[in-house]
Interface confidence: medium
């Protein structure tokens, strides 16, 4: 080993060196949080870049650059360091038009903390491992969601467009002429029945166990879907989103109530099955895989 390499190895394995890098990263993160940084912070930025460059040079001199098994670029954690340095010099010395977009990559410096703190390294390692192991569970989840989305599509397509429409029309008014002239929320409230405080017209259905309209109103299928048109089973993609919402239990009771009002109470069976299989089983299966991966990484 050359004297330069010996010195580099000594520096690299020294605990003070790790401490210096950790402190640098944390200080850098503090500076990054500043709203309107003063002019002198520019010099501090250069100092940080210098320390990161020094760290990488020490690692390259001690371990080699890329040829050989344990060299600098063979460790994925060093890829992050390399990218951070490259972007630091790019944003500083190369005129690249929209620099603000490139400046975003400075945030990657915060991720350097992971490679320095051993506990964090373990957790992130487990996270990456769990993502690899999750592929099968993800395929199963997407498959199950797709199957239920197709069932939902067949059962509820167009149902959420059912609305309670006012009976007393003017002589020459038609549903089409009304829908063409409706512009504001106020116009809609004139013709459709709204519950107090609701932003969507009251849903209804044509089956005996679905929601009925109050006196003076008839159930019609017209207009857009609830929640600005985002809640529906009208296409596979919207149905898939609705099923994902059920699986994650994201305000799912609202979707459940809307659908049951428009389609009928019998369809609660569909929701019971989806919640049990999707929300209780699949979500916990995902958590189990993550837990297993973390356990393996710890060992």
């Amino acid at each position: 080993f050359s004297p330069l390499r010996r010195i580099s190895i000594k520096i690299l394995v020294h605990s003070l060196f790790s401490m210096l890098i950790m402190c640098t990263i944390l200080t850098n993160c503090i500076f990054m949080t500043m709203n309107n940084p003063p002019d002198w912070t520019k010099n501090v930025e250069y100092t940080f870049t210098g320390i990161y460059t020094f760290e990488s040079l020490v690692k390259i001199l001690a371990r080699g650059f890329c040829v050989g098994e344990f060299t600098f670029l063979r460790d994925p954690w060093n890829w992050l360091d390399f990218v951070v340095i490259v972007f630091a010099y790019l944003t500083e010395f190369v005129n690249l038009g929209n620099v603000s977009a490139l400046r975003t990559f400075r945030v990657l410096r915060a991720l350097k903390t992971i490679s320095v703190i051993p506990g964090l390294k373990t957790i992130v390692g487990a996270l990456i491992q769990s993502v690899k192991k999750l592929s099968d569970v993800m395929i199963l989840t997407v498959f199950c969601l797709s199957v239920f989305a197709l069932i939902g599509l067949q059962l509820f397509m167009g149902n959420l467009k059912h609305k309670c429409f006012r009976n007393s029309l003017e002589n020459n008014e038609t549903l089409e002429s009304i829908m063409n002239t409706l512009e504001s929320e106020e116009d809609f409230r004139k013709y459709f029945y709204y519950l107090e405080g609701s932003k969507d017209a009251l849903l209804c259905g044509f089956s005996t166990d679905s929601g009925q309209c109050p006196e003076g109103y008839t159930c019609v299928k017209i207009g857009r879907n609830p929640d600005y048109g985002y809640t529906s089973f009208d296409t596979f993609s919207w149905a898939f989103l609705a099923l994902f919402r059920l699986m994650t239990q994201d305000y799912w009771e609202n979707l459940y109530q809307q659908t049951l009002r428009a389609a009928g109470k019998t369809y609660m069976i569909f929701f019971v099955v989806v919640i049990f299989l999707g929300s209780f089983y699949l979500i916990n299966l995902i958590l189990a895989v993550v837990a297993m991966a973390y356990e393996e990484q710890n060992q």
């Epitope: 429409f165 009976n167 299928k221 017209i222």
Partner: nanobody, 120 residues
Framework: EVQLVESGGGVVQPGGSLRLSCAAS????????MAWYRQAPGKQRELVAY??????ISYADSVKGRFTISRDASKRVYLQMNSLRPEDTALYYC???????????????WGQGTLVTVSS
């Protein structure tokens, strides 16, 4: 395509009765609301009566107590007209708000009209 066909019109003496019927032909998934309108010569079209699937019924003030609207389980609506007066002379139209197919929107459909003449 959905079509509404009216029948039962004709000439009747004042005080007489007529029964108009309207049937929907073609693909009909769901009938939401059926109504009878009339247009007397030189006048605007006006609502006579309507019936909804829930049994909600309404009549124009001029025909209350004399006319009766009803619908059956099939795609038909009827207008029973009693104690007819000369001012009831008009072209009677049937109108329905209906959904032709399960995935289509509710639309407004009109019949061609049937003429009712009340004259002595």
């Amino acid at each position: 395509e959905v079509q509404l066909v009216e029948s039962g019109g004709g000439v009747v003496q004042p005080g007489g009765s007529l029964r108009l019927s309207c049937a929907a032909s073609g693909p009909v998934f769901n009938i939401n609301r059926m109504a009878w309108y009339r247009q007397a010569p030189g006048k605007q079209r006006e609502l006579v009566a309507y019936v909804t699937p829930t049994g909600d019924i309404s009549y124009a003030d001029s025909v209350k107590g004399r006319f009766t609207i009803s619908r059956d389980a099939s795609k038909r609506v009827y207008l029973q007209m009693n104690s007819l007066r000369p001012e009831d002379t008009a072209l009677y139209y049937c109108r329905a708000l209906l959904q032709p197919r399960r995935y289509s929107n509710t639309r407004t459909y009109w019949g061609q009209g049937t003429l009712v003449t009340v004259s002595s």
